[in-house]
């Protein structure tokens, strides 16, 4: 036994053109609710067929009134999970239908009116106890985003919720024929509820109410030891009341049947009975074929050559996954060059380019200097999507229209005085310093820190910065 859980993340307009009109208006406020229907295996998804695995209805969402003129946003959702309990084993493969319903809250005679807004359906493989699986489905112009999982209800565990667990009775080990319950190592596998009086030590059951004997025991309640006087060849589980057997572990240790298959021991080995949707000697092969329509989002289904793969989905651009169920985040590949903004519209990819760039992927660098002039003899330099002027000496600013004050940055070191000059600036150095920016101290013995003073200049003379 266990519970299938569905979490609706959003319901709103899908990507691409033709956004749907909001289902609610000021004149007709409404609220949403959801219905989920589950069927085992890969059954037909006709809405009318019974939901053999179960169905659930969500609570009503908050009342919503459309803002006039605004496009339909993601609509407010009901709180909480939709939970579908299942009594028997989880089948491993299932079909689902999720319906979005609108409850109109106008002044209807006879109470609120309900109408179906969208229906999505699919087939999936899912092991119980696994993580949340995310999904996106589209119905017309609407898009539904949701997650789902199947979890076992204690004491059941396993991918099909067929193994049972209970707290350990002894601190160190589990009882005869019972193993620790991974991942709950502090718990042990628990036997099913067998026939009343069935020996807990020597009997077991694979179906509630039965009592099958471990090797070495017999009788309707497995309380009678098998006689060892006529022992010839120890072999196999006890038949009914006779034979010669040695006690041993319980049935199908380790459950070697995959995907929730049920296991029964044979004298030397075991046999598997597979649930719907699986086959193979150990139920290891999925029985899904192209006839079941397993490929979503327009994926092309072809029969698999591999015996363990009955079909292969070839996904259209923008989708991936074994069933084409996952949308590719095409923007994660950063297709837009030169800092362009990527927009995945579903049907197409768009790049919104920064100024100075163009092209489908912003790959073209526009001529930034076209039609732009730099004043006062400045030259235009392209780059970075915007033009830049390299100004002549004495001028600055974006277009070289501002007269520059070369002394504004205080370029002369060690207290040197700065003079603006037609070719730049000149530093008049304080005593004891020399160099174009007065950066070099003059040694006391008269030698400079420079290898040689430029000809015609003595320390202390103004140094022109060329």
């Amino acid at each position: 036994a266990g519970v299938f859980e569905l979490q609706i993340h959003s319901f709103g307009p899908g990507p691409g053109p033709g956004a749907p009109r909001s289902p609610c208006s000021a004149r007709l406020p409404c609220r949403l609710f959801f219905r989920v229907c589950l069927k085992p295996g890969l059954s037909e998804e006709a809405a009318e067929s019974p939901c053999a695995l179960g169905a659930a209805l969500s609570a009503r969402g908050p009342v919503y009134t459309e803002q006039p003129g605004a496009p339909a946003p993601d609509l407010p959702l009901p709180d909480g999970l939709l939970q579908v309990p299942f009594r028997d084993a989880w089948p491993g493969t299932f079909s689902f239908i999720i319906e979005t319903w609108r409850e109109e809250l106008g002044d209807q005679i006879g109470g609120p009116a309900w109408s179906l807004l969208a229906r999505v359906a699919g087939r999936r493989r899912l092991a119980a106890g696994g993580p949340w699986a995310r999904d996106i489905q589209r119905a017309g112009a609407w898009e539904l985003r949701f997650s789902y999982r199947a979890r076992c209800e204690p004491p059941a565990v396993g991918t099909a919720c067929t193994r049972l667990c209970r707290p350990r009775s002894a601190p160190s080990r589990c009882g005869p024929g019972l193993r620790p319950c991974a991942p709950l190592e502090d718990e042990c596998e628990a036997p099913l509820v067998c026939r009343a009086g069935c020996s807990p030590e020597h009997g077991f059951c694979e179906q509630p109410g039965e009592c099958r004997c471990l090797e070495g025991w017999t009788g309707p309640l497995c309380t009678v030891p098998v006689s060892t006087s006529s022992c010839l060849s120890p072999r196999g589980p006890s038949s009914a009341t006779t034979g010669c057997l040695v006690p041993g572990p319980g049935p199908c240790d380790g459950n070697p049947c995959a995907n929730g298959g049920s296991c029964s021991e044979t004298p030397r080995s075991f046999e598997c009975t597979c649930p719907r949707g699986f086959y193979g000697l150990r139920c290891e092969v999925s029985g899904v074929t192209c006839a079941d329509g397993p490929c979503f989002n327009g994926g092309l289904c072809v029969g698999g050559a591999d015996p363990d793969s009955a079909y292969i989905c070839h996904c259209p651009p923008g989708f991936q996954g074994s069933n084409c169920e996952k949308r590719v985040d095409r923007c994660s590949l950063q297709p837009c060059r030169n800092g362009g903004l990527c927009l995945d519209l579903g049907h197409a990819l768009r790049c919104r380019c920064r100024a100075g760039f163009a092209g489908p992927r912003c790959e073209h660098d526009l001529d930034d200097c076209a039609g732009r002039a730099c004043a006062n003899g400045g030259t235009c330099v392209e780059g970075g999507g915007a033009h830049r002027c390299s100004c002549a000496l004495g001028f600055g600013g974006r277009d070289c229209r501002e007269r520059a004050d070369p002394c504004a940055a205080r370029p002369c070191a060690h207290g040197g005085r700065c003079y603006a000059h037609f070719s730049g600036l000149v530093c008049a150095c304080a005593p004891g310093y020399m160099g174009a920016r007065c950066e070099f101290p003059v040694h006391p013995d008269g030698a400079s820190a420079l290898p040689a003073a430029p000809p015609g200049l003595r320390p202390g003379d103004p140094q022109r910065y060329l």
Epitope: G248, P249, D253, G254, P256, T266, P267, R268, S269, F270, E271, C272, Y279, G280, L281, R282, E284, P307
Partner: antibody, heavy 116, light 106 residues
């Protein structure tokens, strides 16, 4: 006592298809599992695959793209085909019967040599 | 795939010796393990199934034990007919054989 008799071509060229058949004498064909196992000269045993009377198969994952095992219940026979053979497929091939995964009755073995 | 590792690969022993061969599985196989004996030029012969059950007609000096990932085959008193190669085989998931242990005369 069930006996298994096997036959098939013993010398193949690379890229050809190996084909072996195993006939079952003196026992019921239903309810059992029918296996093929091979043993390269001087090496250990390698399980190839098995089939039950209903025709459901299970294969060694490393060989399954090349293996076909089929059963003919009307003749009490089952067969192995291994496509695109290479020298690495040179081995003694055994057919066997038993329960799932556990052959307890073996054929005499057929040496198959792959050589150009 | 489940890998099976046997040790030792060769074992020298004398008639009357107690011989133990170990087989280790790369993951738990519960009790789904068999032991085979093979003599040169012959097909293998099943000795033990379900880790510890003796196949009909096999002498009682052969015994098997273990579960999960560690298994042993024991020959309590080696006889001249027991010099052969022994293989373990798991059948929990598909089937895989160990690489074999050759028991030879010391």
């Amino acid at each position: 006592q069930v006996q298994l008799q096997q036959w098939g071509a013993g010398l193949l060229k690379p890229s050809e298809t190996l084909s072996l058949t195993c006939a079952v004498f003196g026992g019921s064909f239903s309810g059992d599992y029918w296996s093929w196992i091979r043993q390269p000269p001087g090496k250990g045993l390698e399980w190839i695959g098995e089939i039950n009377h209903s025709g459901i198969t299970s294969f060694n994952p490393s060989l399954k793209s090349r293996v076909t095992i089929s059963v003919d219940t009307s003749k009490n026979q089952f067969s192995l085909k291994l496509s695109s053979v290479t020298a690495a497929d040179t081995a003694v091939y055994y057919c066997a019967r038993g329960e799932l995964g556990i052959p307890d009755n073996w054929g005499q073995g057929t040496l198959v040599t792959v050589s150009s | 795939d489940i890998q099976m590792t046997q040790s030792p690969s060769t074992l020298s022993a004398s008639v009357g010796d107690r011989v133990t061969i170990t087989c280790r599985a790369s993951q738990s196989i519960s009790r789904w393990l068999a032991w085979y004996q093979q003599k040169p030029g012959k097909a293998p012969k099943l000795l033990i199934y379900k880790a510890s059950s003796l196949e009909s007609g096999v002498p009682s000096r052969f015994s098997g034990s273990g579960s999960g990932t560690e298994f042993t085959l024991t020959i309590s008193s080696l006889q001249p007919d027991d010099f052969a190669t022994y293989y373990c085989q798991q059948y929990n998931s598909y089937s895989t054989f160990g690489q074999g242990t050759k028991v030879e005369i010391k």
